[in-house]
């Protein structure tokens, strides 16, 4: 019999029960559980009364959630604890707004942040929920200030990994991209070894994604195909006679690119990606070390 | 609420060129990028390539180049696609849209090529 | 070009059952996928964008999974206005390409 099914007999049929069974003591609520509750919660705990937890959205219950009420009106509780099974949004600076706005987030989602009326964003605009459960780049980077005077307000300039939208930098789609350089990078979630650019690399970085350079020899790049004259890359330049792409001199860089730090001849340098390419183009052999400039000579 | 608003449909003959419009409302023009899709009846979708109304730069799937050309017009928050040299083949409807993904689909535009 | 391969082509199936919908990227797109639905005479719709994030007004019955080159696109108890066409589509590099779709009937 289901408990309320006893306690329907115990009223009608009274006699069927010895004194012994009514119970006349019950154990306390039952404890509480950090990011959790329990299920169905009456009011009454006798002895032997089973309860049952459960956790809040974007927690998942780790151990037995089943506690029983004991005979010493103690109860009996397994380890359990609900464990973060999602990002939340951590307490946003004053006139900070988030979107998509919504209790917990999954890994890989992203939320973005603006800032209402008159007031303008420093910092990132846009988060990834990590497989850490931890915000990628931090929230607390985010914050509003005041804006200026709109007449001296200028339009934000916007890194080369970034378009204007809204009247705020917010990161390129992969596809925006265009020719760049080849590079390989592993990717630090998975472990794999990929062919990137470095354009797409700043895009992904860009959006919380977390990528290294590896070596060029670890991966397989685009084989470097002659190319007809209407897709030359930065590096190449069109060859009337033939119609096809050939090499540029690193002089003769026009579009440059992004300024990246390339190591050529065991030593470090900051050149453009057109550089670079250039020099790969004609056989040399170049390890980009850096999608940024050169540490050294950044400082 | 973002609307993009496409021109009606188009009946011309084989060897012509076309001109269809779409019109953005709804958010800011320069916003985001317009895409251009094709799709030939019963058939998938083919992207036929973007432009970015900010600086009006193109990106063209290689298959369309030569067959389309995309422009903008800011101040009436207008995208356009030319499609020349006609044939049977280019008989679909094709689709304006907007966003990064895309996000937002026009209601599309129907071309009849026929002699 | 990056290729994407949508199967199956067709599917019938009941209210309220459950469907997987999958798309194979021939290169790594890095989750760079979105799912639309299109009705018979309408334009596209977004459902699921960067391969598990849905679109505003989705309704939570879709879910969007997958990493590298496999993708999945899932409808929990299908609903009568949940059948039509699916694409998928990366964009990851130009040209986006969409997979060929699946057409959704009602058994």
């Known amino acids: 019999c289901e408990d309320e099914e006893l306690e329907h007999l115990r009223l009608l049929e009274p006699h069927c029960f010895p004194l012994s069974l009514v119970p006349t003591e019950f154990c306390p609520s039952p404890p509480a559980l950090k990011d959790g509750f329990v299920q169905d919660e009456g009011t009454m705990f006798p002895v032997g009364k089973n309860v049952v937890y459960t956790c809040n959205e974007g927690y998942s219950l780790i151990g037995n959630p089943v506690a029983r009420c004991g005979e010493d009106l103690r109860w009996l509780v397994g380890e359990m604890h609900c464990q973060k099974i999602a990002c939340v949004l951590p307490v946003l600076m004053d006139g900070i707004q988030s979107h998509p706005q919504k209790p917990f987030y999954t890994v890989g989602e992203k939320v973005t942040v603006s800032c209402s009326g008159g007031m303008s964003l420093e910092g990132p605009s846009a988060f990834l929920c990590g497989s850490s459960l931890k915000w990628s780049p931090e929230m607390k980077n985010a914050r509003c200030v005041q804006k200026e005077n709109p007449l001296t307000q200028a339009v934000p300039k916007c890194q080369r990994w970034e378009k204007l939208q809204n009247s705020r930098c917010v990161c390129k789609m992969p596809y925006e991209c265009g020719p760049s350089l080849d590079v390989c990078a592993q990717d630090e979630r998975s472990k794999r070894i990929l062919p990137l650019t470095v354009c797409k690399m700043h895009v992904l970085h860009c959006q919380g994604r977390n990528y290294t350079l590896t070596g060029r020899d670890s991966c397989t790049l685009p084989a470097s195909a002659e190319k007809a004259c209407g897709a030359c890359p930065l590096w190449g330049k069109c060859d009337a006679e033939s119609s096809k792409c050939v090499c540029r001199e690193a002089s003769e860089c026009e579009e440059e690119g992004f300024s990246i730090c390339v190591e050529v001849n065991g030593k470090e340098q900051t050149m453009s990606e057109c550089e670079a390419g250039a020099l790969r183009c004609r056989g040399q052999s170049i390890s980009v070390t850096s999608i940024r400039p050169c540490a050294a000579e950044t400082q | 609420e973002v609307q993009l608003q496409q021109s009606g449909p188009e009946l011309v003959k084989p060897g012509a060129s076309v001109k269809m419009s779409c019109k953005a409302s709804g958010y800011t023009f320069t916003d985001y990028n317009m895409h251009w899709v094709k799709q030939s009846h019963g058939k998938s979708l083919e992207w036929i390539g973007y432009i970015n109304p900010n600086n009006g730069g193109p990106s063209y799937n290689q298959n369309f180049k030569g067959k389309a050309t995309l422009t903008v017009n800011k101040s009436s928050s207008t995208a356009y696609m030319e499609l020349r040299s006609l044939t049977s083949e280019d008989s679909a409807v094709y689709y304006c849209?907007?966003?990064?993904?895309?996000?937002?689909w026009g209601q599309g535009t129907t071309l009849t090529v026929s002699s | 070009d990056i290729q994407m391969t949508q199967s199956p082509a067709s599917l019938s199936a009941s209210v309220g059952e459950t469907v997987t919908i999958t798309c194979r990227a021939s290169?790594?797109?890095?989750?760079?996928l979105a799912w639309y639905q299109q009705k018979q005479g309408k334009s596209p719709q977004l459902l699921v964008y960067?391969?598990?994030t849905l679109a505003d007004g989705v309704p939570s019955r879709f879910s969007g999974s997958g990493s590298g080159t496999q993708y999945s696109l899932k409808i929990n108890s299908l609903q009568p206005e949940d059948f039509g066409s699916y694409y998928c589509q990366h964009f990851w590099s130009t040209p986006l390409t969409f997979g060929a779709g699946t057409k959704l009937e009602l058994k």
């Open positions: 849209a907007c966003g990064n993904y895309p996000d937002y």
């Open positions: 290169g790594n797109i890095h989750n760079y």
């Open positions: 960067n391969a598990k």
